[in-house]
């Protein structure tokens, strides 16, 4: 039976059919971050749980040292949510000399690192000013989109301030990717 | 022609090929919630429209009694947005004795229920402090991620306060899942 | 070899198998918007980058004149993030006569246009009151969900105020869709 008998008329003959169940996939969940040095003007990367609870990696998608390693070229949907929480925000203080303070902010970046390319690529960024009146505040930033990745690419999640990340529950802060 | 001639070299032979069009999928949209009693310390579950307007269920993914029923084991992408709106928030009142009030909050949880397991599992949570200065406020919480589910699992969306959910438009508050 | 030997027992025989790599897909990124006339009570549509940087269209998914053109009927996952930024918000001013002002707001709508249907359909809406105490504020609205689309449907992203859209970085404001 010819393969193209299954295929819509526009399918390229050479495109391989593929079982969905064997595609690279990962869902990583938050863990408490270990104190690490990071450069002043560089957002620190989060590290993740990859096998306990809701977390998993499968079909050659591996997690190592804060990175998800892309095992196969293709189009991937990549997503992350980071829940931040804090205990006041400077700009809620009384304005000095009638001039509002620069607002605090929280930022999440999903970054791609390609060994053959010197600079990391920012794939997705969610950034929000935080100017809360109440004493303690909390809020999530969610990101998700599709990107063409190459075998060997590495993905990480960077945040503006690691100390504000809510690491208490695996459903609040997470990171995942799957081959489409 | 042998099936594996279509397959990339890393494909497990036993993985079945599968037509995408017959995978379980659902997109549910908000309806006005009917007045029901719910326990004080338990977040109430939303019920949904499953066939009118933009809403649909297909390929054995069924909606019944606030639950999406998973018909087949596999990896699913699950998502929801809930738009909340309210007409004040207590912490916007003048601070008593110079001390800010504990903020109000809004929370969405996507929950999995497995009959063989006594406790529901929280898959995703979006939670946000609400401390609005203006009189009426509104904002969405969006969630989405991939999970390995088993046939017979049930999914629901719980919220911290059903009365704050914006039920007026199907594009503002919704819930969906699809087999990858 | 018979096709159904690949298929789970519940697969409809007539459903064509399909190589994932040839499915219509697009990820569009923000560009600076050119000033255009738009009607007072109609949210303006954003236009997008479709080939430079992270942006791409493939497999007959075309971008033209603010629209993504759907080349094939099926279920699509559609997503967008718009990052807004501004320089104060009226409702942070002192309340007049004890009555809070109506809050400002930011809104994103993903809209479907079907030539045979007179009215556009709003698929997704993210709307948020903005009542910031600080001077300059910024925040994203993210949307994503699955919809059944028909060949020839057109998708666009509309916003409440084009002048508040952050067009500075391709990772902050984007729009995409892919056939499932």
């Amino acid at each position: 039976l010819k393969g193209q008998e299954f295929a819509p008329s526009h399918q390229q003959v050479y495109a391989p059919l593929r079982a969905d169940g064997d595609k690279p996939r990962a869902h990583l969940t938050v863990v408490r971050q270990t104190p690490t040095q990071h450069f002043k003007n560089q957002f620190p990367a989060l590290h993740w749980e990859h096998e306990l609870g809701l977390a998993f990696t499968k079909n050659r998608m591996n997690y190592t040292n804060k990175f998800l390693l892309i095992p196969e070229s293709g189009d991937y949907f990549i997503y992350s949510q980071v829940t931040f929480r804090g205990m006041t925000s400077e700009c809620s203080e009384i304005r000095q000399a009638g001039r509002p303070n620069k607002p605090d902010s929280i930022t999440v970046v999903i970054t791609k690192v390609t060994d053959s390319y010197p600079e990391p690529t920012q794939l997705l960024m969610g950034t929000k000013s935080v100017c809360e009146v109440g004493s303690n505040w909390f809020q999530p930033i969610y990101l998700g989109a599709m990107f063409s990745l190459q075998e060997g690419d590495k993905l990480m999640v960077n945040v503006s301030d690691i100390s504000l990340v809510d690491y208490t529950k695996e459903d609040k802060t997470f990171f995942g990717a799957f081959l489409l | 022609l042998k099936g594996q001639e279509f397959a990339p070299s890393h494909q497990q032979v036993y993985a079945p090929l599968r037509a995408d069009g017959d995978k379980p999928r659902a997109h549910l949209t908000v309806v006005r919630q009917t007045p029901t009693q719910h326990f004080k310390n338990q977040f109430p579950a939303l019920h949904w429209e499953h066939e009118l307007g933009l809403a649909f269920t297909k390929n054995r993914m069924n909606y019944t009694n606030k639950f999406l029923l998973i018909p087949e084991s596999g990896d699913y992408f699950i998502y929801s947005q809930v738009t909340f709106r309210g007409m004040t928030s207590e912490c916007s009142e003048i601070r008593q004795a110079g001390r800010p009030n504990k903020p109000d909050s809004i929370t969405v949880v996507i929950t999995k229920v497995t009959d063989s397991y006594p406790e529901p599992t929280q898959l995703l949570m979006g939670t946000k402090s609400v401390c609005e200065v203006g009189s009426n406020w509104f904002q969405p919480i969006y969630l989405g991620a991939m999970f390995s589910l088993q046939e017979g699992d049930k999914l629901m969306v719980n919220v911290s306060d059903i009365s704050l959910v914006d039920y007026t438009k199907e594009d503002k508050t919704f819930f969906g899942a699809f087999l990858l | 070899l018979k096709g159904q030997e690949f298929a789970p027992s519940h697969q409809q025989v007539y459903a064509p198998l399909r190589a994932d790599g040839d499915k219509p897909r697009a990820h569009l990124t923000v560009v600076r918007q050119t000033p255009t006339q738009h009607f007072k009570n109609q949210f303006p549509a954003l236009h997008w980058e479709h080939e430079l940087g992270l942006a791409f269209t493939k497999n007959r998914m075309n971008y033209t004149n603010k629209f993504l053109l759907i080349p094939e009927s099926g279920d699509y996952f559609i997503y967008s993030q718009v990052t807004f930024r501004g320089m104060t918000s009226e409702c942070s001013e002192i309340r007049q006569a004890g009555r809070p002002n109506k809050p400002d707001s930011i809104t994103v709508v993903i809209t479907k246009v079907t030539d045979s249907y007179p009215e556009p359909t709003q698929l997704l809406m993210g709307t948020k009151s903005v009542c910031e105490v600080g001077s300059n504020w910024f925040q994203p609205i993210y949307l994503g969900a699955m919809f059944s689309l028909q060949e020839g449907d057109k998708l666009m992203v509309n916003v409440s105020d084009i002048s508040l859209v952050d067009y500075t970085k391709e990772d902050k404001t984007f729009f995409g869709a892919f056939l499932l």
């Epitope: - | 309806v31 006005r32 919630q33 009917t34 007045p35 029901t36 009693q37 719910h38 429209e49 009118l52 709106r85 309210g86 007409m87 004040t88 928030s89 207590e90 009189s135 009426n136 306060d161 059903i162 009365s163 704050l164 007026t168 | 009555r99 809070p100």
Partner: antibody, heavy 119, light 111 residues
Framework: QVQLVQSGAEVKKPGASVKVSCKAS????????INWVRQAPGQGLEWMGW????????GYAQKFQGRVTMTADRSTSTAYMELSSLRSEDTAVYYC????????????WGQGTLVTVSS | QSVLTQPPSVSGAPGQRVTISCTSS?????????VHWYQQLPGTAPKLLIE???NRPSGVPDRFSGSKSGTSASLTITGLLPEDEGDYYC??????????FGGGTKLTVLG
């Protein structure tokens, strides 16, 4: 202009049912929820429930659950409220009211229908 | 179950100002959809007067205003007129979005 016109007064015996109609005009009937509110003689207003004319979905006050049924006929832009197992304390003026979607305030009211329950 | 409490009656002379309060038994009155006020003149159906604490529908004179503080909302009528005499109801919602009405306040215009 928006109008809600209700059916005429009814006299019913205890244990019977009554069905009150509310014909809408001047707007798209399926775009706004209809509520029913009653007022016993000399008493205050009491909410009974809401009806979405588009989907047919309803929400009833706990007090009336099991006894009230709200329906809509989209072809005639008419909402109905049926109350069963009537008792003397159901004697009241019954109002239909159209809601403002954003705030659920009752913006337009019918003129009211007096239902008297007497043996 | 939340309860909205209004004074049974208030009165004032023409030209005066009167305020009708509406107090909730729960922590924050109308947190979801606000508090609405209705006027019911003798022998007529209720009429929406104030929507969402503060907002007057078109056609409602600016003599009518609404406010909110903590667990109570208020309707204030300035420059009282004889034709304002009637019953006034506040309305809000409980946690399941069931509508609640206050018991009503009878306004008498003296003289």
């Amino acid at each position: 202009q928006v109008q809600l016109v209700q059916s005429g007064a009814e006299v019913k015996k205890p244990g019977a049912s009554v069905k009150v109609s509310c014909k809408a005009s001047g707007y798209t009937f399926t775009s706004y929820d209809i509520n029913w509110v009653r007022q016993a003689p000399g008493q205050g207003l009491e909410w009974m429930g809401w009806l979405n004319p588009n989907s047919g979905n309803t929400g009833y006050a706990q007090k009336f659950q099991g006894r009230v049924t709200m329906t809509a006929d989209r072809s005639t832009s008419t909402a109905y409220m049926e109350l069963s197992s009537l008792r003397s304390e159901d004697t009241a003026v019954y109002y239909c009211a159209r809601e403002v979607p954003e705030t659920a305030a009752f913006e337009y009211w019918g003129q009211g229908t007096l239902v008297t329950v007497s043996s | 179950q939340s309860v909205l409490t209004q004074p049974p009656s208030v009165s004032g002379a023409p030209g005066q100002r009167v305020t009708i309060s509406c107090t909730s038994s729960s922590s924050d009155i109308g947190a979801a959809l606000g508090v609405h006020w209705y006027q019911q003149l003798p022998g007529t159906a209720p009429k929406l007067l104030i929507e969402g604490y503060y907002n007057r529908p078109s056609g409602v004179p600016d003599r009518f205003s609404g406010s909110k503080s903590g667990t109570s909302a208020s309707l204030t009528i300035t420059g009282l007129l004889p034709e304002d005499e009637g019953d006034y109801y506040c309305q809000s919602f409980d946690g399941t979005l069931s509508a609640l009405f206050g018991g009503g306040t009878k306004l008498t215009v003296l003289g």
